[in-house]
């Protein structure tokens, strides 16, 4: 299992909700969709309803840094994506309310995100090798990169 | 095409217990859990209860626990559902049903199967 | 657990009519609402989820409204083929709860 991040005993505040009920497409054009209860996975929908609809919101860190920290959460509810560890499924996680403030073992809900054109990528702050990935017949979960995939596309605005 | 077809009608008497099979097709099985749920003669709907194809976790409604146990059989995408101490009452058809959650977050039964009826009867 | 009341819980209606059912959440269940049709010794299929998304495939005269506690179901043009059960369930909160179901019958 990946190392515990350095990075954990960091304190991280939160701004706002940046995005609003947006869809994750990696680049196999497979959509993020809720499966299980408490787990993710990617498909080919022919219903865009199916997705799952993320809001994501920013943090700020004690230490300047020029990646951004996002949580990212089911739009309209209170379930929020946590890291596990390298290619275990990330999980869905219920708080009562955004956290306010993140340190320490909590950095597990923090992403770095990090865009490339229209390439979106996002890194776990508890383990900053590891990007959120999408693997043909299996759960989204952490991966280092290939065979999983690591980059996606943002659909904003989805009716 | 998905498909949910479940095992036939079943004659039992009161205090036995029985088993009903729900063979899934036509989409990746551990990705969606399934319901159980069953309808009285001339009565609503009544969920039983939810098993995670993934993990096998089970949940089970109040009306139900003690009696009721859900299973799998993940190498043939089957998913099964026993209830003991059988009495008059659960005289009824037992539905298994797939999950969804509309935009992640609205949880839908959007495949079901064609229904098992079970009678008990002395 | 949420409570699901339906109502009626029977109508009977003419083909061509205008049809409305009713369900109300005992508390805010955030459009959380989906509609099933059940026809007489057949499994029920679902119509409507999110409130008013109808699920592709399932014909335009059925439509869904509603919002917080209170959502209507409505046939817009009432076909033979309609004369079925229908049921509400609320997708919010576990155990998922049903309404008790309205038997729609022709005139």
């Known amino acids: 299992s990946a190392p515990f991040s350095f990075l954990s005993n960091m304190t991280y505040h939160f701004i706002r909700i940046i995005k609003h009920e947006f869809i994750l497409n990696d680049t196999l054009n497979q959509t993020i969709i809720r499966a299980n209860d408490q787990y993710l996975t990617a498909a080919a929908i022919h219903n865009l309803d199916e997705a799952v609809k993320f809001d994501m919101g920013a943090y700020t860190s004690s230490k300047d840094d020029t990646k951004v920290p996002v949580i990212l959460r089911i739009s309209k509810t209170q379930l929020y994506v946590s890291a596990q560890d390298e290619d275990q499924p990330v999980l869905l996680k219920e708080m009562p309310e955004i956290p306010k403030t993140i340190t320490g073992s909590e950095t597990n809900f923090l992403f770095f995100w990090e865009t490339h054109g229209t390439k979106n990528y996002f890194i776990s702050v508890a383990h900053p090798n590891l990007f959120i990935a999408t693997k043909h017949d299996n759960w989204v979960c952490l991966a280092k990169g290939l065979p999983s995939i690591t980059d996606f596309q943002i659909l904003e605005n989805q009716a | 095409e998905i498909q949910l077809v479940q095992s036939g009608a079943e004659v039992k008497k009161p205090g036995a217990s029985v088993k009903v099979s729900c063979k899934a097709s036509g989409y990746t099985f551990k990705y969606y859990g399934m319901n159980w749920v069953r309808q009285a003669p001339g009565q609503g709907l009544e969920r039983m209860g939810w098993i995670n194809t993934y993990t096998g976790e089970s949940r089970y409604a109040d009306d139900f626990k003690g009696r009721v146990t859900f299973t799998l059989d993940t190498s043939t995408s089957t998913a099964y559902m026993e209830l003991s101490s059988l009495r008059s009452e659960d005289t009824a058809v037992y539905y298994c049903?797939?999950?969804?959650?509309?935009?992640?977050?609205?949880?839908?039964?959007?495949?079901w199967g064609q229904g098992t009826t079970v009678t008990v009867s002395s | 657990d949420i409570q699901m009341t339906q109502s009626p819980s029977s109508l009977s209606a003419s083909v061509g009519d205008r049809v409305t059912i009713t369900c109300r959440a005992s508390q805010d269940i955030s459009n959380r609402l989906n509609w099933y049709q059940q026809k007489p010794g057949k499994a029920p299929k679902l119509l409507i989820y999110y409130a008013s998304r109808l699920k592709p495939g399932v014909p335009s005269r059925f439509s869904g409204s509603g919002s917080g506690t209170d959502y209507t179901f409505t046939i817009s043009s009432l076909q033979p083929e309609d004369i079925a059960t229908y049921f509400c369930?609320?997708?919010?909160?576990?155990?998922?709860?049903f309404g008790q179901g309205t038997k729609l019958e022709i005139k």
């Open positions: 049903a797939r999950d969804i959650y509309y935009f992640g977050s609205d949880y839908a039964m959007d495949y």
């Open positions: 369930q609320q997708g919010n909160t576990p155990p998922y709860t």
